[in-house]
């Protein structure tokens, strides 16, 4: 069992909870409801999990649901750097990953999501209220940031409702294009809810699948959407005690440096990969306005020729930036 804090998900209730209600009539309203609720939320979602077997071990997962090609992802805890936050990992799609203790493993899960595992310290319930923040940047178009933390209760069913906040800092084109569909969906949802108003509403359950396991495909982006959804993903297991945190310093190297090739298996491409992309279900959501930081004093090694700050489509290993040719 896991304790989770997540941004609302585009995910239906688990099979078997519908009772006498038909599966189709149950899933569609709830998918539409989620779309309506999340229509105005930021494009970044954050999921924090604490393993029951290792109560001091955390997995942070972050994803970017907007259009645009991400050129850098930063994961931190304790808030933004101006308020005492500490960088746990920095992930670049071409040049690799930097991470600092207590981060144990940071990696790209998909092109639009990352995960970070934090080492456990053995305490029974460390840092239950620790805030983890993820910042996705696409230079120079803009950056997007969101934060999340474990709910006060360890019962996933008692997760706090999402608190969307206006933290987007880039073009909203691509999001606005969906508004028409959402409007129609919301109207249709109201119609369906009126038809089923005398039936008991099913409970949305948080997913208990592993971060890598495919989830119910209640909302799989169309191929057109897939082209616009380029999001890095990272997982982190960390020890959650600031006192024991091995803080990185500007002139000190990272605890270790991993240079990941762009064809790494953690960054699948194509419709199949997108269809199985895990999407968080729900939880607490906190916005952070100022930037995060990473103590990266030394320039990381290049993984090979042709590596790019702005991924270049002309290269064999590259991707193009979000705005295309002007």
């Amino acid at each position: 069992m896991r304790t989770e804090a997540q941004v609302p998900a585009l995910q239906p209730p688990e099979p078997g909870l519908e009772g006498a209600m038909g599966h189709r009539t149950l899933v569609l309203p709830w998918v539409l409801l989620t779309l309506c609720v999340t229509a105005g939320t930021p494009e970044v979602w954050v999921q924090v999990r604490m393993e029951a077997t290792e109560l001091s071990s955390f997995t942070i997962r972050c994803g970017f649901l907007g259009s645009g090609s991400i050129s850098l992802v930063t994961v931190s805890w304790g808030g933004p750097n101006g308020a005492g936050g500490t960088t746990l990992a920095v992930l670049h799609p071409e040049r690799g990953i930097r991470q600092w203790a207590p981060a144990r493993q940071a990696r790209w899960e998909t092109q639009s999501s990352i995960s970070l595992i934090l080492e456990g310290s053995g305490a029974s319930s460390p840092c239950a209220n620790t805030t983890f923040c993820c910042k996705f940047a696409s230079f120079p178009e803009g950056s997007w940031e969101a934060c999340g933390s474990l709910p006060p209760s360890s019962d996933p069913g008692l997760s706090a409702p999402p608190t969307p906040a206006p933290i987007l800092r880039a073009d909203l084109a691509g999001i606005l294009g969906v508004s028409g569909v959402l409007l129609f969906g919301c109207v249709y949802l109201l119609h369906l809810l009126r038809r089923h108003k005398h039936r008991p509403a099913p409970r949305l359950q948080p997913s208990r699948t592993s971060p890598q396991a495919p989830r119910a495909r209640a909302w799989a982006p169309s191929q057109a959407s897939q082209a616009a959804l380029h999001v890095p993903y990272a997982t982190i297991n960390t020890s959650c005690r600031p006192a024991t945190l091995d803080t990185a310093h500007p002139h000190g190297g990272p605890s270790w440096w991993a240079s990941l090739p762009t064809h790494a298996a953690h960054r699948p491409q194509g419709p199949a990969a997108w269809a199985s992309t895990p999407i968080p279900a729900r939880g607490s959501f906190v916005s952070v306005e100022n930037g995060l930081y990473a103590q990266a004093g030394e320039r990381p090694p290049h993984t090979g020729p042709g590596l790019t700050l702005f991924p270049d489509p002309r290269g064999p290993r590259a991707m193009e930036g979000p705005l295309g040719v002007r």
Epitope: V90, N290, G291, T308
Partner: antibody, heavy 120, light 106 residues
Amino acid sequence: EVQLVESGGGLVKPGGSLKLSCAASGFTFSSFAMSWVRQTPAKRLESVATINNGGINTYYPDTVKGRFTVSRDNAKNTLYLQMSSLRSEDTAMYYCARHDDFLYYAMDYWGQGTSVTVSS
Amino acid sequence: QIVLTQSPAIMSASPGEKVTMTCSASSSVSYMYWYQQKPGSSPRLLIYDTSNLASGVPVRFSGSGSGTSYSLTISRMEAEDAATYYCQQWTSYPLTFGAGTKLELK
């Protein structure tokens, strides 16, 4: 050692054109976004153009949009700024600068600058 | 675009004195940087993303802030620190700079 060397500046009449160059060395040029930043006689700094590492995406502030064009030749490790329809307010010292993504796109290296004077 | 206002425009300090200058943004900023420029030289990166020292920058320099308010502090002024300091933000394009704070040696 990272080096950025600008050239091409000079005196030009209003409405005229000028092409600046920035020769880069000491790093993998094709891996970095680059910008042109100018400093006016009043010592104000203004970013006038940014280009991604592959040379595909370019960005300009409204003050120069349609008049300035940034480009790069990664094979020659050179950044360019084509300036046309020049105005007196374009008079400035023009610097090329490198953006380092692991420093959150800070401009970590700057050239020595080339002076552009627009006057009749 | 985001406008950055630096204050004071000009200040002076004696060697060993603590110096603090501020940079106020017209709206919330994602990334803040500080540059130092001496007469006849190009700008030099001091601090990136609010509080991180660039390579080779003395530890007497520090940055802090969040949202719309940022500051650069020199814990103990030294003669070589006399220069003009610029803040720069990146939130979305265009990148913008403050007008600068000129720090003179008293």
